[in-house]
């Protein structure tokens, strides 16, 4: 049957009609920066090329004696998950390697960086189809490495790395601190995270998503038709490596921000028992396991929105965090997040010609979180909107007044260090879709957007007892854009976007009293762009045979079904 | 890629009547910072990443090396130029002495230090 | 054990080229720079230049600076220096040395057992 | 470039003799010296880096001093094996020149 990990990432409707894969990522070009690999071996024969580049430190330990299998294990397994004839997961990808770690599995930044530019030298001399290069590896954190990355990105390259076996937060390590880099976290069988002997996956803020990374079977360089099961955040990225090909392959122009946000769409969500993390971290971290997409069809007309949690601020009086999305994505709201409660609240605002989320501490607060919500929105013309704090009782209110600008986020800022849980919450009055509300001591920030077609509404929940919780979604075809709390009273810690729900977290029910300071009002911003959905069905009319669909449907095999476990 | 700017000793030379060098000095309130990482056992140092600011030209970072190298020598310590960085970022990898970060932080072009530092296969 | 063996000995006509090879072997041929240094029958040491291996950074002697290529191929631990456009006064023995670095004093610590090459019409 | 002139350039001496052979740099390379010795036909041996650090397996009659432009090989006590011509070179700056060596023979 099928290995769990392959199964675990083809879409739920192939596994029942039991279709392979397609040899897909016959377009692209696959970069692994490793070991040396065996490249004779049957599953990634004449799919692996060996640069010459090479540049690897001596080896540890007078010793050590170099063993050809042993110095290709970690390369040529990584290269076999990724394009192997058996148990592979793009399986027409073609890679070229570059030995930039030794027979102990250890490098440097410095040979890493030589790599890298190798890569783009290599890139600017023969120009070929979608790039992808695989970092398996990790070093602490490394601004320079984190730099050339970015360079390297930028020049329209996907990179995408492991986040680490250390069980510990990825930003602390580079490449996976990179915010340019998609950095994948491992899950196993279960859904869990990977353990891996006192250690494990990495987790928190700088993961993107997680992928199989446990008792992963692929080429071994034992001998040329030798399998082996291994496990790492390594292997996890490798699938995903895998799945970038799949999609560049079906779409060669999707660009970085548009093929992380369709990983991030088509992911599995909340899946992980995100108990096996730190507790600090479990809101941090994304509760999502890779998959392939059912089809490219029907992905283009969506709105694609992502959540961007910024480093903490630390909990200086003045205090600031700052949550940014990538270069193609339009930032569409602004929230912010305290474990304390104790924050100053947040705003849009311009910084290098770019819109960015701010949140601010309070005097006693610990810190504070930014929470960004990015989107693909082609066309855009986005604009923050602000209101003073206002001396009436009803509190501060702003609207999108300029002609064919939707609402898409509402924020709140105030100077003082305590709004106030014996003011009365103020409620937006219906029939103002186009307004933000907040205390009358906050100044109030709306975010308006002009996109082609777009079209937001609002959605409230509020539940007048106190609770730590309380959550509203957008329905099917619609898309998070913003994500607040009303009124922004002190016992409310924040709100963040969750996929496609608005959370509000407040205070433990035990410090609050169940009077209606306790009401919380969770309100979300759902937005669709109609012009999108045309493009895509014209799109649709006038190509044949171009998806990941049709890929899919080319080729069958006797595989079993496998149902996906989720927890 | 070579060395194209000249005789060695000419840059020597050249820079025997500047004071350490800051005749060029940085920009005014610009000051290039040092990094290495925060794992101790992860370090490598004696090996240097030395990172110009991002419109250096790839003569201007081979100037920059050789100078380093020069004002390195007037003070008796040995440096190798191990690489020079282009298409990516600009900059040199160099093996030296720690003793001379202070000196190559006031160099002109230069962003940053980065010490060299352990990747692992995960 | 550590060392570089060197190809063989070459005959060539004035204004051709000559590519000698280094072999390495016994440690990691990226981990360390490889310098080309000549000697003149009878004469001194000359220093020509390096190649770092890992990187194919090279920096040479301006006497050189010229007529001298200088590469490497990692797969086979190899280094090759080809010195063109040969005059009667390149007929010397050349040698390929590794250079050990440390903290802040560096110095050749294996060498080949040369190669000659002999210039003549 | 930087001028090493090696003296004398050749000397003879016997199995015993304590010998000493300097080099001068036409300016300032600190202790960045290094001093090899080379037999006829083969290549040259590492004997002293940086000035006056023996080299692993280098017997201790051997020793190095100096820093600056001025630098001396010491042989303590002259045995058969040390006949061979001597070579300083300098690392402090490119080109890495190299004396013009000392041949010592046997008396």
């Known amino acids: 049957s099928i290995p769990w990990n392959l199964e675990r990432i083809t879409p739920p409707r192939y596994r029942a009609d039991e279709y392979q894969p397609p040899d897909g990522g016959s377009l692209v070009e696959v970069y692994l920066l490793d070991t040396s690999i065996q490249s004779d071996h049957r599953e990634i024969e004449g799919r692996v090329m060996v640069t010459d580049f090479e540049n690897v430190p001596e080896e540890d330990g007078t010793r050590f004696h170099r063993q050809a299998s042993k110095c290709d294990s970690h390369g040529t397994h990584l290269a076999g998950v990724v394009s192997g004839r058996d148990a592979g997961v793009a399986k027409g990808a073609s890679m070229r390697s570059l030995r930039v770690l030794n027979c102990q599995g250890k490098g440097t930044v410095s040979g890493t960086l030589i790599g890298l530019e190798f890569i783009r030298k290599s890139q600017l001399v023969q120009p070929v189809g979608p790039l992808v290069v695989l970092l398996p590896l990790a070093g602490g954190y490394s601004r320079v490495l984190n730099a050339a990355c970015q360079r390297l990105a930028r020049a329209g390259v996907v990179l995408v790395t492991a986040a680490g076996n250390f069980r510990d937060d990825a930003c602390l390590y580079s490449p996976a601190s990179a915010p340019e880099v998609i950095t994948v976290g491992a899950t196993n069988a279960q859904d869990q995270p990977v353990t891996l002997g006192t250690l494990g996956t990495n987790f928190g803020r700088c993961v993107d998503l997680f992928a199989p990374g446990e008792d992963i079977i692929g080429a071994s360089s034992d001998c040329s038709t030798c399998f082996v099961s291994q496990s790492g955040t390594s292997q996890a990225a490798a699938h995903v490596a895998g799945i970038a090909a799949m999609m560049l392959s079906a779409e060669p122009e999707l660009t970085l921000a548009e093929l992380r946000q369709r990983l991030i769409h088509f992911s599995a969500k909340d899946v992980i028992n995100e108990a096996w993390f730190p507790e600090d971290q479990r809101v941090l971290t994304p509760n999502l396991v890779a998959a392939l997409p059912p089809s490219t069809h029907g992905a283009g007309w969506q709105l694609f929105c992502r959540t961007v949690w910024s480093a903490h601020s630390g909990p200086t009086r003045m205090a600031t965090a700052v949550a940014r999305c990538a270069p193609d994505e339009e930032l569409l709201s602004c929230s912010s997040f305290s474990r304390s409660g104790k924050r100053r609240g947040e705003r849009m605002e311009a910084q290098g010609g770019k819109l960015v989320c701010r949140a601010h501490n309070a005097f006693g607060g610990e810190g504070v979180y930014a929470i960004a919500r990015c989107c693909l929105l082609p066309q855009a013309n986005c604009s923050v909107h602000t209101a003073p704090p206002a001396e009436a009782s009803m509190g501060t209110r702003v609207h999108c007044h300029q002609q064919g600008h939707v609402l898409t986020g509402c924020s709140s800022h105030w100077e003082v260090e305590d709004l106030g849980t014996h003011k009365p919450p103020v409620l937006r009055p219906r029939g103002q879709p186009n307004q933000c509300v907040g205390h009358r001591e906050a100044s109030i920030h709306a975010s308006c957007c002009h996109a082609p077609g777009l079209e937001c509404k609002v959605k409230e929940h509020g539940i007048p007892a106190p609770q730590e919780q309380v959550t509203v979604a957008c329905e099917e075809g619609w898309t998070l854009t913003g994500c607040s709390a009303l009124p922004g009273t002190s016992h409310v810690l924040g709100a963040y976007a969750v996929d496609n729900t608005c959370v509000v977290r407040s205070r433990d029910v035990s410090t609050t009293g169940s009077t209606s300071e306790g009401a919380v009002t969770a309100v979300a911003i759902c937005c669709r762009s109609r012009h999108l959905a045309q493009a895509s069905q014209e799109l649709q009319g006038s190509t044949s045979g171009s998806g990941l669909n049709d890929i899919f449907e080319a080729q069958k095999i006797e595989w079993h079904e496998h149902h996906h476990h989720h927890h | 890629q070579e060395d194209e700017d000249g005789d060695y000793e000419e840059l020597v030379l050249a820079l025997r009547s500047e004071e350490d060098g800051l005749a060029e000095a940085p920009e005014h309130g610009t000051t290039a910072t040092f990094h290495r990482c925060a794992k101790d056992p992860w370090r490598l140092p004696g090996t240097y990443v030395v990172v110009l600011k991002e419109e250096t030209h790839l003569s201007q970072s081979e100037r920059t090396a050789r100078r380093l190298q020069a004002q390195a020598a007037r003070r008796g310590y040995l440096t190798k130029i191990l690489h020079v960085f282009h298409g990516l970022l600009p900059g040199f990898l160099v093996k030296m002495s720690g003793d001379l970060l202070e000196l190559a932080l006031k160099l002109p072009h230069v962003d940053y230090i980065e010490e060299d530092s352990s990747v692992f296969a995960q | 054990q550590v060392q570089l063996v060197q190809s063989g000995a070459e005959v060539k006509k004035p204004g051709a080229s000559v590519k000698v090879s280094c072999k390495a072997s016994?440690?990691?041929?990226?981990?360390?720079?490889i310098h080309w240094v000549r000697q003149a029958p009878g004469q001194g040491l000359e220093w020509m230049g390096y190649?770092?291996?890992?990187?194919?950074?090279?920096k040479f002697n301006q006497k050189f600076k010229d007529r001298v290529t200088m590469t490497r191929d990692t797969s086979i631990s190899t280094a090759y220096m080809e010195l063109s456009r040969l005059r009667s006064d390149d007929t010397a023995v050349y040698y390929c040395?590794?250079?050990?670095?440390?903290?802040?004093?560096?110095?050749?610590?294996?060498w080949g057992q040369g190669t000659t090459v002999t210039v003549s019409s | 470039d930087i001028v090493m002139t090696q003296s004398p350039s050749s000397l003879s001496a016997s199995v015993g003799d304590r010998v000493t052979i300097t080099c001068k740099a036409s300016?300032?390379?600190?202790?960045?010296v290094a001093w090899y010795q080379q037999k006829p036909g083969k290549s040259p041996k590492l004997l002293i880096y940086s000035a006056s650090n023996r080299y692993t397996g280098v017997p201790s009659r051997f020793s190095g001093s100096g820093s600056g432009t001025d630098f001396t090989l010491t042989i303590s006590s002259l045995q058969p094996e040390d006949f061979a011509t001597y070579f300083c070179?300098?690392?402090?700056?490119?080109?890495?020149?190299f004396g013009g060596g000392t041949k010592v023979e046997i008396k």
């Open positions: 300016q300032n390379v600190y202790t960045a």
């Open positions: 190649i770092n291996p890992s990187s194919t950074y090279t």
């Open positions: 040395a590794r250079e050990r670095i440390y903290s802040n004093y560096w110095f050749f610590d294996v």
């Open positions: 016994g440690y990691t041929f990226t981990g360390y720079t």
């Open positions: 070179q300098q690392l402090s700056s490119q080109p890495e020149t």
